[in-house]
Interface confidence: medium
């Protein structure tokens, strides 16, 4: 039970992580007029990964599109690989996830294949969260760097006086909506792979044991999984596995593959 | 590299019109805009308006509307302004000028200038 | 529309000298930038954004400023630095320049 909440919540958690990414991607204000102490402007301007925008006074706002993949900054082209690549592998993460979840029952789809899924989508998810928030965080270095670049002689006094910081572009909605949807898919992620682990729980537990129980034949086999049963609360659940199936071992040492991805 | 060749000089009557072009090489054309900006001899700097050739949306100084027309042809990347109903006070040099693809960015390149006479 | 005001109109520099020229702006606006135009020329964008140098200018021109108030300063006056410099705001339409300061060599 508390598996397939695991697997469900972070099915779910996955889903509004990648729906947010997705809508950062589509956002304009990755980037936007910072009005710090230059509150009345009469007109504000913003920037997306695919278009700038402009909002005068009157409340009127337009948009261009950026029309070129060669004349933007590489930077911004880095970005936009990286948030795409986060999307398309949320996108097929989720897609795989469907078919692992528990409880969900695709023919005879066997436990172990549900691991797999599960594993699988896990790990694509933390990828999917990584590259949002790795792209995320490039384009706000860029502008933190752009920001304190331009400012850097804020303190050519003239006269003793000290200069205002001048107005740049800070960080935009964009960005903000980028990291938080990011760690929602790379935790949904996490939960998928706590959630594989406990999938097949029976794999240690039986693990190189046999014995005979009065009146049923009930064999074991070492490194495999219960291959048939006369109890009634199992037979529900019968699954047969071949004895090349993964440990358990094996199975924890999957995501540790890939904590430096 | 970038360059904005403009078309050379013109010498009109009152009342007629006069179109001037601007071939931009060395960038993506769609890219960027296009400003065009007036100077009267010995007179400072004024902005006409844009065009955005990517999408072909304009926008223009209050004070030409009605007067000057932007257009920009993207199968030979130039940019023209027509100029309408003259009279001696368009008598001034027009230059084109490329701004960047963030609305208030600087104007990094400019062509060389069109020397437009209004005169009877 | 937001007016420009250059000041002073006309200002002459001996070689070496310190040179300061300012522009002040009718209302607050993000950036300003500057440009140079020599007689017979077209403009030549010279500081962008208040105070990133244009390619090719020289480490002796510096801009700065916020809000009303922006400045481009000269280090050391040299001879190719006798021109007309233009401020220019983007920052609300119509887009305008300043009258322009015209440098001159002593």
């Known amino acids: 039970m508390a598996v397939t909440a695991c697997q469900g919540l972070g099915f779910v958690v996955s889903l509004i992580g990648i729906a947010g990414i997705i809508a950062a991607t589509c956002m304009d204000q990755w980037s936007t007029q910072d009005l710090y102490n230059n509150p009345v402007t009469a007109v504000f301007n913003y920037q997306g990964l695919w278009r700038s925008c402009v909002r005068e006074s009157s409340g009127f706002t337009e948009c261009r599109g950026y029309f070129t993949l060669l004349g933007l900054p590489a930077m911004l082209q880095a970005v936009r690989a990286l948030m795409i690549v986060g999307i398309v592998l949320g996108a097929i993460g989720l897609l795989v996830s469907i078919f692992a979840l528990k409880c969900i029952r695709i023919g005879s789809m066997e436990d172990s294949a549900k691991a797999n899924m599960t594993l699988t989508s896990g790990i694509m998810f933390i990828v999917s969260g990584l590259c949002a928030i790795a792209g995320v965080s490039v384009f706000a270095n860029m502008l933190v760097t752009n920001f304190w670049m331009s400012t850097a002689n804020m303190y050519t006094g003239m006269g003793g006086m000290v200069q205002t910081v001048q107005t740049r572009y800070t960080f935009g909605a964009a960005l903000f909506v980028g990291w938080v949807a990011g760690g929602l898919t790379l935790i949904g992620g996490v939960m998928m792979c706590i959630a594989c682990r406990g999938l097949a729980p029976e794999e240690t537990n039986y693990k190189a044991v046999s014995y005979h129980a009065s009146g049923h034949s009930v064999a074991y086999k070492p490194g495999g999984f219960k291959a048939s049963t006369g109890f009634g609360s199992n037979t529900k659940n019968k699954k047969i596995y071949d004895g090349g199936a993964r440990t358990e071992d094996e199975v924890q040492s999957y995501p540790s593959k890939h904590d430096y991805v | 590299q970038v360059q904005l060749q403009q078309s050379g000089p013109e010498l009109v009557k009152p009342g007629a019109l006069v179109k001037i072009s601007c071939k931009a090489s060395g960038y993506t054309f769609t890219s960027y805009d296009i400003n065009w900006v007036k100077q009267r001899p010995g007179q400072g700097l004024e902005w006409i308006g844009w065009i955005y050739p990517g999408d072909g949306s304009t926008k223009y100084n209050e004070k030409f509307k009605g007067k000057a027309t932007l257009t920009a042809d993207k199968s030979s990347s130039t940019a023209y302004m027509q100029l309408s109903s003259l009279t001696s006070e368009n008598s001034a040099v027009y230059f084109c000028?490329?701004?960047?693809?963030?609305?208030?960015?600087?104007?990094?390149?400019w062509g060389q200038g069109t020397t437009v006479t209004v005169s009877s | 529309q937001i007016v420009l005001t250059q000041s002073p109109a006309i200002m002459s520099a001996s070689p070496g000298e310190k040179v300061t020229m300012t522009c002040s702006a009718s209302s607050s606006i993000s950036y300003m930038h500057w440009y140079q135009q020599k007689p017979g020329t077209s403009p030549k964008r010279w500081i962008y954004d208040t105070s990133k140098l244009a390619s090719g200018v020289p480490a002796r021109f510096s801009g700065s400023g916020s809000g009303t108030s922006y400045s481009l300063t000269i280090s050391s006056m040299e001879a190719e630095d006798a021109a007309t410099y233009y401020c220019h705001q983007r920052s609300s339409y119509p887009y305008t320049f300043g009258g322009g300061t015209k440098l001159e060599i002593k």
């Open positions: 000028a490329r701004g960047g693809y963030r609305y208030d960015e600087a104007m990094d390149y």
